[in-house]
């Protein structure tokens, strides 16, 4: 394959290639810029289906459309996990599966998709207007969540089309990491573009087809994403609420776990609160929450004691640290 990079700088281009070359040097950065802006946005799809055989039985299928490695999948109903939703199953690629009634069988379908069968009987059974959410934690993208529910007019056996409506619960580390790399790449690309534009071509004939390139708007938000900043946070109130008490059907894998330190060696950064930034909904339920673990406003006031190396005679409530509320 022949690329312009192989042409020595001082050598005149081959006849006939001059215009094409100028055109291609302009097109390539634009293609790369487009890739820059659109890269790193994985999606989660959710499909909810009512079984034809058992009218109160549901099958939820979820998938992750992204390049990262999945570290955890959480399926919940009644809303997103930790925000009014009740966890039905947690699936870990190595550690196994943990599920709770009315979840009957949770399993991995592929490396990036799972399915969950819910049995419906008794107080904890789902109903047609229940919202089911799937949250995929992956590296380096962060956590992404989408929710879906069975359409009101669904016949048994029919399924709702997969709803790739990501809640974009992006963990700070994942988002900043990927964005940082992409931003750096795009800025560097722009820098090269400008350098290329302002550098005089040595001993080359002036190009006949080199219109003035428009200034690249790197990372300019689209109208959709600009409008997103003004969309209110949408939640779905379902009349069918999950039971607040249920029994477990554990399918735990091997128990291994990151060591909890026995004492503080240093003062780490505290957990970041989720900063809610809504985005426009393409599916039934969409919100954006960016942060590490906490959802803003969920920590009760005057809760945790602070982790500190120094004794404080005023007691734990007086201390500040990553474990408590400042």
């Amino acid at each position: 394959m022949r690329t312009e990079a192989q042409v020595p700088a001082l050598q005149p281009p081959e006849p006939g290639l001059e215009g094409a070359m100028g055109h291609r040097t302009l097109v390539l950065p634009w293609v790369l810029l487009t890739l820059c802006v659109t890269a790193g946005t994985p999606e989660v799809w959710v499909q909810v289906r009512m079984e034809a055989t058992e009218l109160s039985s549901f099958t939820i299928r979820c998938g992750f459309l992204g390049s990262g490695s999945i570290s955890l999948v959480t399926v919940s109903w009644g809303g997103p996990n930790g925000a009014g939703g009740t966890t039905l199953a947690v699936l870990h690629p190595e550690r196994g599966i943990r599920q709770w009634a009315p979840a009957r069988q949770a399993r991995w379908e592929t490396q990036s998709s799972i399915s969950l069968i819910l049995e419906g009987s008794g107080a904890s059974s789902p109903c047609a207007n229940t919202t089911f959410c799937c949250k995929f934690a992956s590296f380096p993208e962060g956590s992404w969540e989408a929710c879906g529910s069975l359409p009101p007019s669904s016949d048994p056996g029919l399924s709702a089309p997969p709803t790739p409506a990501p809640i974009l619960r992006a963990d700070l580390a994942g988002i900043l990491g990927v964005s940082g790399v992409l931003l750096f790449g795009c800025v560097y690309l722009l820098h090269l573009l400008r350098r290329h534009k302002h550098r005089p071509a040595p001993r080359l004939q002036p190009s006949r087809t080199s219109p003035q390139a428009p200034r690249a708007r790197a990372w300019a938000p689209s109208q959709a994403s600009q409008a997103a900043l003004h969309v209110p946070y949408a939640t779905i109130n379902t009349s069918c609420r999950p039971a607040t008490l249920d029994t477990a059907h554990p399918h735990g894998g091997p128990s291994w776990w990151a060591s909890l330190p026995t004492h503080a060696a240093h003062r780490p950064q505290g957990p970041a609160a989720w900063a809610s930034t809504p985005i426009p909904a393409r599916g039934s339920f969409v919100s954006v929450e960016n942060g590490l673990y906490a959802q803003a406003g969920e920590r009760p006031p005057h809760t945790g004691p602070g982790l500190t190396l120094f004794p404080d005679p005023r007691g734990p409530r007086a201390m500040e640290g990553p474990l408590g509320v400042r």
């Epitope: 609420r241 060591s259 957990p271 673990y293």
Partner: nanobody, 127 residues
Amino acid sequence: HVQLVESGGGLVQPGGSLRLSCVASASGFTYRPYCMAWFRQAPGKGLEAVAGIDIFGGTTYADSVKGRFTASRDNAGFSLYLQMNSLRAEDTAVYYCAAGDSPDGRCPPLGQGLNYWGQGTMVTVSS
């Protein structure tokens, strides 16, 4: 709104046993934290991680309590227990239950992300 309520603290003689309990309750939904952990704070000392257990049942312990304390969770996933045996005077502290979620389901180091905390229960080991 999530609440953690500890119970089971009290006065016990050295070598004795106690069982602490912690229940996570939420208004309107069932909250199953990915991680639930016990921390303690002795009088005039800093906070110390005692034990943690994640959603898959994986446990970890501080060196000072290994072999004497056992952390467990109920099947439903929202209650945490700490069985304390062979108690010593240095185990005297306020014991706090903490809970929270992490991206990979594990208990995060140093307690980051454990956003919910109980008010604490006092354990006194004295003869």
